[in-house]
C-alpha cells in the first residue's frame, strides 16, 4: 500500500512539476525591468525566452518575438535547449509512469516490468527537474551579471548634457515558477525511484514451509504479499500553474495606490 501511495504521489508531484516547467518556458516574464532606484518610467519592459514585451502605463502591451536564431545570445539558446529537453524528458517520463502505475492493470504485465518502468520514469523526472533548475539558474546568473554591468555604467554621459538611462532587468516570475517546478519534478522522480525498490519482487525464492501449531493448521507462505487495493483511482490531477498572464496592477511598478512622481 505504501509503495502504491509513494508511486502515485510521485506521479502527481511530477505531473504538477512538468506542467510548471511548461508554464515557465512559455511565460514572458523571465526578466522584468528593475524599478528600484530607477527614474519612474511610464513604460514597463519584460522579456521571456521567446519574445520581449513592453507595457505602457495606458495598459497597451506590445510583444515582439525573437525572429532570429543566429543573432541570439548563446546563453539564451542554451536555456531554451535545457527547458525543452526538460519538457521532452518529463513528458516521456509521464507517459512511461502511467503504464508503470501499480493501480493500473495492463494485460499480464510483470511486477518486474512495472518496477523497471517506474525506475526509468523516476530517472527521467530527476533529469527533467535538473534540466529546468539548470536552465533557470543559468538565466538568473546571466541576469545578475548584466544587472551589475549595467549598474556600473547606468548613466552614460553624452556630451556632458544629455543622459541615457540603461534599463536594468531583474528576476521575473517565470524564474520562480521554474525553480519550484523543477524542484517538484525532481522530488517526484526521487519518489518514483523509491517506489521502484518496493515494487521489485524478491530474488530469493524460499520453499514453502508448513508450521503446525496446536489446534490450528496454518500454512505461512512467504514471498508474495501484495496490496490488492488500488491507489487514488479517483484522484483529480489539477494543473495549478499560472500561464503568465498578469494584470496591470499585479506587475506594475507602483507599490502603493498613491504615488508622487
Amino acid at each position: 500500500m505504501a509503495v502504491t501511495a509513494c508511486q502515485g504521489l510521485g506521479f502527481v508531484v511530477s505531473l504538477i512539476g512538468i506542467a510548471g516547467i511548461i508554464a515557465a518556458t512559455c511565460m514572458d516574464q523571465w526578466s522584468t525591468q528593475d524599478l528600484y532606484n530607477n527614474p519612474v518610467t511610464a513604460v514597463f519592459n519584460y522579456q521571456g525566452l521567446w519574445r520581449s514585451c513592453v507595457r505602457e502605463s495606458s495598459g497597451f502591451t506590445e510583444c515582439r518575438g525573437y525572429f532570429t536564431l543566429l543573432g541570439l545570445p548563446a546563453m539564451l539558446q542554451a536555456v531554451r535547449a535545457l527547458m525543452i529537453v526538460g519538457i521532452v524528458l518529463g513528458a516521456i517520463g509521464l507517459l512511461v509512469s502511467i503504464f508503470a502505475l501499480k493501480c493500473i492493470r495492463i494485460g499480464s504485465m510483470e511486477d518486474s516490468a512495472k518496477a523497471n518502468m517506474t525506475l526509468t520514469s523516476g530517472i527521467m523526472f530527476i533529469v527533467s527537474g535538473l534540466c529546468a533548475i539548470a536552465g533557470v539558474s543559468v538565466f538568473a546568473n546571466m541576469l545578475v551579471t548584466n544587472f551589475w554591468m549595467s549598474t556600473a555604467n547606468m548613466y552614460t554621459g553624452m556630451g556632458g548634457m544629455v543622459q541615457t538611462v540603461q534599463t536594468r532587468y531583474t528576476f521575473g516570475a517565470a524564474l520562480f515558477v521554474g525553480w519550484v517546478a523543477g524542484g517538484l519534478t525532481l522530488i517526484g522522480g526521487v519518489m518514483m525511484c523509491i517506489a521502484c525498490r518496493g515494487l521489485a519482487p524478491e530474488e530469493t525464492n524460499y520453499k514453502a514451509v508448513s508450521y503446525h501449531a496446536s489446534g490450528h493448521s496454518v500454512a505461512y507462505k512467504p514471498g508474495g504479499f501484495k496490496a490488492s487495493t488500488g491507489f487514488g483511482s479517483n484522484t483529480k490531477n489539477k494543473k495549478i500553474y499560472d500561464g503568465g498572464a498578469r494584470t496591470e496592477d499585479e506587475v506594475q511598478s507602483y507599490p502603493s495606490k498613491h504615488d508622487y512622481v
Partner: antibody, heavy 119, light 113 residues
Framework: QVQLVQSGAEVKKPGSSVKVSCKAS????????IEWLRQRPGQGLEWMGE????????KYNVKFKDRVTITADESTSTAYMELSSLRSEDTAVYYC????????????WGQGTLVTVSS | DIVMTQSPSSLTVSLGEKATISCKSS????????????LTWYQQKPGQPPKRLIY???TRESGVPDRFSGSGSGTDFTLTISSLQAEDLAVYYC?????????FGQGTKVEIK
Amino acid sequence: QVQLVQSGAEVKKPGSSVKVSCKASGYTLTGYWIEWLRQRPGQGLEWMGEILLGSGSIKYNVKFKDRVTITADESTSTAYMELSSLRSEDTAVYYCARKGLRGNSFDYWGQGTLVTVSS
Amino acid sequence: DIVMTQSPSSLTVSLGEKATISCKSSQSLLNAGNQKSYLTWYQQKPGQPPKRLIYWASTRESGVPDRFSGSGSGTDFTLTISSLQAEDLAVYYCQNDYYYPFTFGQGTKVEIK
C-alpha cells in the same frame, strides 16, 4: 463620441481650495487614466497627476505634493481635482484629459476650467 | 524632471511653405524594449485645449492631415509641416511621455507671414 466636460470657471481667494470636476462619456471608463494638467496665462502646460478609473490608482506630480487631491466617482463617471492653499500663481486654465491606449499621451481633452485666484 | 527644450519659440512662415520645429529632451526618451521614442506633439489653437497630432515621435493621430510629420529618436525630435495652411496657426508643444512626471516644452508659436 468621447467627451470630457469640465465644471465652470471659479474665482477663489488666496489660501482657499478649489475642486474642478470632469465628467467623461462616450467610452468604457474602466481601465483609462484621467489626467489633470494646468496652463498658466501665456505659459506652457504642466502635468499635475492622474487617476486610473476602475482601480483608484493615483499618481501625483511631486511639485504639487500635499496640495493636490485627485479622486473619482465611478457611479457618475466623474473625476475630480482639488487644489488647496491657493496662491495667485495658481491662476490658470485647468484641463482634464484621457490617456489614450497607445503612446502614453492624451488623446481627448476637456474644454478647460479657468480658476482665478485673487484677493 | 526631464527638461524639454523647443526651438524656435516663434516661427513666421508663408502659406504653402515648410515649417520645422525642433524639440530636445534632457534624457533619452527611447525605450530599448520596443525601439520607440515616447514623445508626443500637440497643437493648441487660441482658446482651445491642445490636440494630439503625433505620438511615438512619428505616428500620426488618425484624422490629422499628412502634411504633419514627426521624426527623430532618443533626444532630438522634429515636427514638420510640409505646406503650411491658414488653419495651422497655433502653438505647438512637445511632451515627454516616457518619464514621470510628464513634462512639456515651452511651446512654439507658428504665425503666418
